[in-house]
Interface confidence: low
Amino acid sequence: GWVWNQFFVPEEMNTTSHHIGQLRSDLDNGNNSFQYKLLGAGAGSTFIIDERTGDIYAIQKLDREERSLYILRAQVIDIATGRAVEPESEFVIKVSDINDNEPKFLDEPYEAIVPEMSPEGTLVIQVTASDADDPSSGNNARLLYSLLQGQPYFSVEPTTGVIRISSKMDRELQDEYWVIIQAKDMIGQPGALSGTTSVLIKLSDVNDNKPIFKESFYRFTISESAPIGTSIGKIMAYDDDIGENAEMEYSIEDDDSKIFDIIIDNDTQEGIVILKKKVDFEQQSYYGIRAKVKNCHVDEELAPAHVNASTTYIKVQVEDEDEPPVFLLPYYILEIPEGKPYGTIVGTVSATDPDRRQSPMRYYLTGSKMFDINDNGTIITTNMLDREVSAWYNLTVTATETYNVQQISSAHVYVQVFNINDNAPEFSQFYETYVCENAESGEIVQIISAIDRDESIEDHHFYFNHSLEDTNNSSFMLTDNQDNTAVILSNRTGFNLKEEPVFYMIILIADNGIPSLTSTNTLTIQVCDCGDSRNTETCANKGLLFIMGFRTE
């Protein structure tokens, strides 16, 4: 049978030939009677066999990383007979590894981001080198990682390539680091090959800095005439952090009057001090307020870095302005009874100069020629007032400072004219009254009512009476209904159109005012030929024909 051991050939041998081993048959007695042959890929070119001894040699330099094993076939022939001594057999030559490949970092470039101030041991990134040598052959592909650059901030786990933080770093001092990692094969023993890679490690920001005011004191001025919302000035704090961690908010700490507010300019991160309420130089000429600044977003674990928030003192000087006069009241309601003679005092308005110099006032009145005003602000009537003409007057009083006539203010003055009983009641309408010739005694001729132009605090009550002077007129009688109406009744049966076509009845109407006023009113009653119907509806037309000279039967 065949006799051989496992065949190995080291790669990258520089010798012209290298003995690998011997192929032999146990029938070979050394008499040089057998011929050994090598067949298969590489036979004759890469590997040669001594046909006498069966010794195999490699005659070419081999690269295990290109090809790690060769499968060949062996034959042994009896030279004398030409027959095979042993059956053809397959065998393997393994190319044994030498450390001829350095570790390579295939995933370059490496870049990692890690939060600043991360504790020791924090994992940053894992770098992995590959070694083309045989991992099963000794230590040729067993790698050890070490740090060439990056101490004392980083360390690398020798066997895993895991980079960890070994010292806390402050982004505000340095925001990125170049770390150089070396990978050595042969677990770092002599003859090891190495490769290096650079890792860019960027520190991401954490909110470990509180904002601090640039100035401890700010001085601003504001005109007392400035409207609410006016920007008074800008304050500025700086924060070494970036992005969201530098976002800040300002607030006012000491401002009991709640006159000022601070809003933030999101573009510049400046605090804009604005007016929240109107200021008055004469009331307070300066304000001292304290502003505080803090970050908008603070993680709980970083809260200790944000205690004792930065503050600044702001002095706001109020500038005096020449202000227009100020009326004591926003508007005035004055009252006067009607019927008073002209020159009657209605009331007084008053305006003052809010400024320190206290300019005297001059007053002007518009809105009605029925009133005038003097320099004391006293309003008087220029005519007798009649409530029934106008019950209210809407006046405007203008005050100007005598020292500066440009400074003007106005106030509305509403004058209410009170009613007095100066109007007697009268018929509420014109009555066209008819009585039929054939009217009977007690028949209703007319119902009358009255009106009074005066205003009544309570309801008007009118009293109707037949004038005592009207003694010759007994054909009709008046009855007061006690409801502000009265009824006129026929006091006889039958009237004669031809003899007495018209009757005039004098009626007195009195009101319930104090004192009471009474009016005398005449009711004209026309006699009408109504026919059998005793209906006066057609009397108006007949009266019209009668007046025009026609006569109807």
């Epitope: 050890l144 360390s155 786990e157 020798p158 066997t159 895993t160 070994s166 770092g188």
Partner: antibody, heavy 122, light 108 residues
């Protein structure tokens, strides 16, 4: 300079578990191998086992079934647990450092703790 | 396991004399991975020699180590009073690591 300090109870009852901790100060626990060695009273030294900072261990086969060595890199500490103790485990227990990288797989113990005496008794 | 046998068990010498301590291994110690330690009462062992012959940092040059394979020697060329202690050899070429039983060097 690196210093080692053993700590743990000085008295353990038989059949219970002996627990010791070694605190490394003055340097990092990383990149070195850390061993436990014991010395019974009046006797020689016996290697118990080592741990690498990534957690890989190698124990003396004579104690392997009862020994657990663990590491806590955040505290710079490594610990020994020896279960089912008997009076034969009464000894002075040392922690020590050896560096794998200076020569071959193991190296001599260049830094030792001062030792802690553990007595196994009921 | 590799068994290390130290001889003599006790060595009585005077200061100024030369001390020779022997350590024999039950099988060859790979790579001459053998160390020597000195231990004084109440103290932890102190590394003297590693790799059979390399002096540890801070060890006086009167201490020297030699040997390979199975036979190793620690020599103290001129004994000082502070050298009197127990000396242990240790092999770390093959797991498990083992120690010799120790040689007590005492003052005569």
């Amino acid at each position: 300079q690196v210093q080692l300090q053993e700590s743990g109870p000085g008295l353990v009852k038989p059949s219970e578990t002996l627990s010791l901790t070694c605190t490394v100060s003055g340097g990092s626990i990383n990149s070195y191998y850390w061993s436990w060695i014991r010395q019974p009273p009046g006797k020689g030294l016996e290697w118990i086992g080592y741990i690498y900072y990534i957690g890989s261990t190698n124990y003396n086969p004579s104690l392997k079934s009862r020994v657990t060595i663990s590491v806590d890199t955040s505290k710079n500490q490594f610990s020994l647990k020896l279960s089912s103790v008997t009076a034969a485990d009464t000894a002075l227990y040392y922690c020590a450092r050896d560096s794998r990288y200076r020569s071959g797989w193991y190296d001599a113990f260049d830094i030792w703790g001062q030792g802690t005496m553990v007595t196994v008794s009921s | 396991d590799i068994v290390l046998t130290q001889s003599p068990g006790t060595l009585s010498l005077s200061p100024g004399e030369r001390a020779t301590l022997s350590c024999r291994a039950s099988q060859s110690v790979a790579g001459s991975y053998l160390a020597w330690y000195q231990q004084k009462p109440g103290q932890a062992p102190r590394l003297l020699i590693s790799g059979a012959s390399s002096r540890a940092t801070g060890i006086p040059d009167r201490f020297s180590g030699s040997g390979s394979g199975t036979d190793f020697t620690l020599t103290i060329s001129r004994l000082e009073p502070e050298d009197f202690a127990v000396y242990y050899c240790q092999q770390y070429g093959k797991s498990p690591i083992t120690f010799g039983q120790g040689t007590r060097l005492e003052m005569k």
